[in-house]
Interface confidence: low
């Protein structure tokens, strides 16, 4: 009926499904059949496929719907050509003329829109002893209108991170330590410099690798270890050791020995594995008390780290196998027997 | 060798805005990693951290405060500047610019003596 | 925010001694731990940061130690120069906060 539908104005955000325009033709055979049925489709002007026609089969009534969002930026004037022809083919020697075409000019207007990270999530790995001052990552985000980008972070809450509000480069301004937690996440914001100051927000993870920085310490609490008094035969007791450090590929392998030249005498250590050692009394004769023995254990790491830990050990007279003190003599009684 | 001087109104009234200079030698706040925060002390009392301003001018705040300070710089006079809105005698305090670099206050100011009173 | 407490207000001690100022902090801080010391006159130097180290120019005699939580500041040989208040600071987590401080006295 129409084969010019003049121009049509439309922001870039409009909606998704609108209906934009509605178009109508007509055909001059039978009602309800294919030969008087029209499909619409667009031939020219929309190579991205932003745009579709739905017919009313009832009024061949045609409605232009947005299928992606459009673009100012990409395609601010499109000449869109679209095409009403039957499902059933013509007669032969019958061939569509002019006025089964028609045409529309969509004219897309610009909407600030917020800039846009090249990636949802940014990664970077960094050993956990880097210098303050370490680039440690760098984000990028664009513009759709080119205004400049300021970077900002938001989230460091242990206050490890700058950001270059210009390049987007993330530098190191504290001591980092894998054992706060790794990946250490922190959200970057990318904000307009003018206009209306529009900001997205991508995802920082910085991951942080191990270094040997946790000396060996005990496993758990070993107060309360006892032997009963006198010891009928030399005893030993099992203690276990660990650290905060990471162990990627293999558990850590302590070296166990006496912290002191002068426990030899009376002790002696061994190694059962990696992480466990055994105390062993070197004789019998020892006086009713707490002894405090000195272990000392490196981890041999890079650099090796040596923790001295202290056992203490009582030798108390026993009732049914338990530690016994007539009232008042002694508090904090042990309670683990060996 | 790296100063900081700190200087003020010394006597302001009640909801009067204080403005405090910090001036420096030594050193300059475009290099990177360097920053420079302001700390307070009332008489008799412990000091206060309330703000900090980096090298390519990000600021951090003592969330305590914050509706009420501004830090801002003049980088190539070599200047510091703190702003308090809304001042009472609780702000009443000795104030001190201190550098900030790799997590230390490494130098401080000698301090300026503000007091708020009616 | 994290509470950073010295619990000795003030210490008297006498020239020569070895003292001990102890500092604990709310939570665990990672060793991340300034001393200052604060002169009567208002002055303010920072002695030892992340826990142990000594800043350049501070005497020998100073030194820190702990970790977690709990923190010393050690002056080894007591000078008349050291009449100061001490205050440790922590700077593991925004808002930069300071324990109360610590007044030495010479007995």
């Known amino acids: 009926e129409k084969s010019d539908y003049g121009n049509l104005t439309l922001a870039e955000d409009t909606n998704i499904g609108s209906t934009i325009l509605t178009i109508q033709a007509t055909d001059a055979d039978e009602p309800f059949t294919g030969s008087s049925k029209i499909l619409y489709h667009i031939i020219k002007g929309d190579s991205e496929g932003r745009l579709g026609v739905d017919t009313d089969p009832h009024t061949n009534t045609g409605y232009v719907i947005i299928k992606k969002p459009l673009d100012f930026e990409t395609a601010a004037v499109s000449n869109i050509v679209f095409k009403a022809e039957n499902p059933e083919p013509l007669v032969f020697g019958v061939k569509y003329n002019a006025s089964s075409f028609a045409k529309f000019t969509l004219i897309v207007t610009d909407v600030n829109e917020a800039p846009q990270f090249s990636q949802h999530v940014f990664q970077a790995k960094v050993s956990e002893d880097v210098a303050i001052g370490t680039k440690v990552g760098n984000v990028t985000a664009k513009d759709p209108e080119g205004l400049d980008i300021s970077y900002s972070l938001r989230g460091d809450t242990r206050g490890w991170l700058k950001i270059d509000h210009v390049t987007g480069e993330i530098f190191s301004v504290a001591p980092l330590d894998r054992e706060a937690g790794s990946p250490y996440r922190v959200q970057v914001v990318a904000t307009e410099v003018g206009g209306s100051s529009l900001s997205s927000v991508s995802e920082f993870h910085l991951i942080l690798m191990d270094v040997n920085d946790n000396p060996p310490r005990l496993a758990k609490d070993y107060t309360g270890l006892f032997f009963c008094h006198p010891l009928s035969a030399p005893g030993s007791l099992i203690f276990e050791a660990t650290d905060d450090d990471q162990h990627l590929f293999r558990g850590p392998h302590f070296t166990f020995s006496l912290g002191s030249g002068s426990l030899q005498n009376d002790w002696e250590v061994s190694k059962i594995n990696g992480t466990h050692a055994r105390l062993s009394t070197r004789h019998t004769e020892f006086e009713e008390r707490e002894y405090v023995v000195l272990i000392r254990i490196n981890d041999g790491g890079r650099p090796p780290l040596e923790g001295i830990v202290s056992l203490p050990v009582t030798f108390c007279s026993c009732v049914e196998g338990s530690c016994f003190r007539p009232a008042g003599h002694q508090t904090g009684i042990p309670t683990v027997g060996m | 060798q790296v100063t900081l001087k700190e200087s003020g109104p010394g006597i302001l009234q009640p909801s009067q805005t204080l403005s405090l200079t910090c001036s420096f030698s030594g050193f300059s706040l475009s290099t990177s990693g360097m920053g420079v925060s302001w700390i307070r002390q009332p008489s008799g009392k412990g000091l206060e951290w309330l703000a900090h301003i980096f090298w390519d001018d990000d600021k951090r705040y003592n969330p305590s405060l914050k509706s009420r300070l501004t830090i801002s710089k003049d980088t190539s006079r070599n200047q510091v500047f703190l702003k308090i809105t809304s001042v009472d005698t609780a702000d009443s305090a000795t104030y001190y610019c201190?550098?900030?670099?790799?997590?230390?206050?490494?130098?401080w100011g000698a301090g300026t003596s503000v007091t708020v009173s009616s | 925010d994290i509470q950073m407490t010295q619990t000795t207000s003030s210490l008297s001690a006498s020239l020569g001694d070895r003292v001990t100022i102890s500092c604990s902090a709310s939570q665990g801080i990672n060793n991340y731990l300034n001393w200052y010391q604060q002169k009567p006159d208002g002055t303010v130097k920072l002695l030892i940061y992340?826990?142990?180290s000594l800043h350049s120019g501070v005497p020998s005699r100073f030194s820190g130690s702990g970790s977690g939580t709990d923190f010393s500041l050690t002056i080894s040989n007591l000078e008349p120069e050291d009449i100061a208040t001490y205050y440790c600071?922590?700077?593991?987590?925004?808002?930069?906060?300071f324990g109360g401080g610590t007044k030495l006295e010479i007995k």
């Open positions: 201190a550098r900030r670099v790799l997590s230390t206050f490494d130098v």
């Open positions: 600071q922590q700077y593991s987590k925004l808002p930069l906060t």
């Open positions: 992340y826990t142990s």
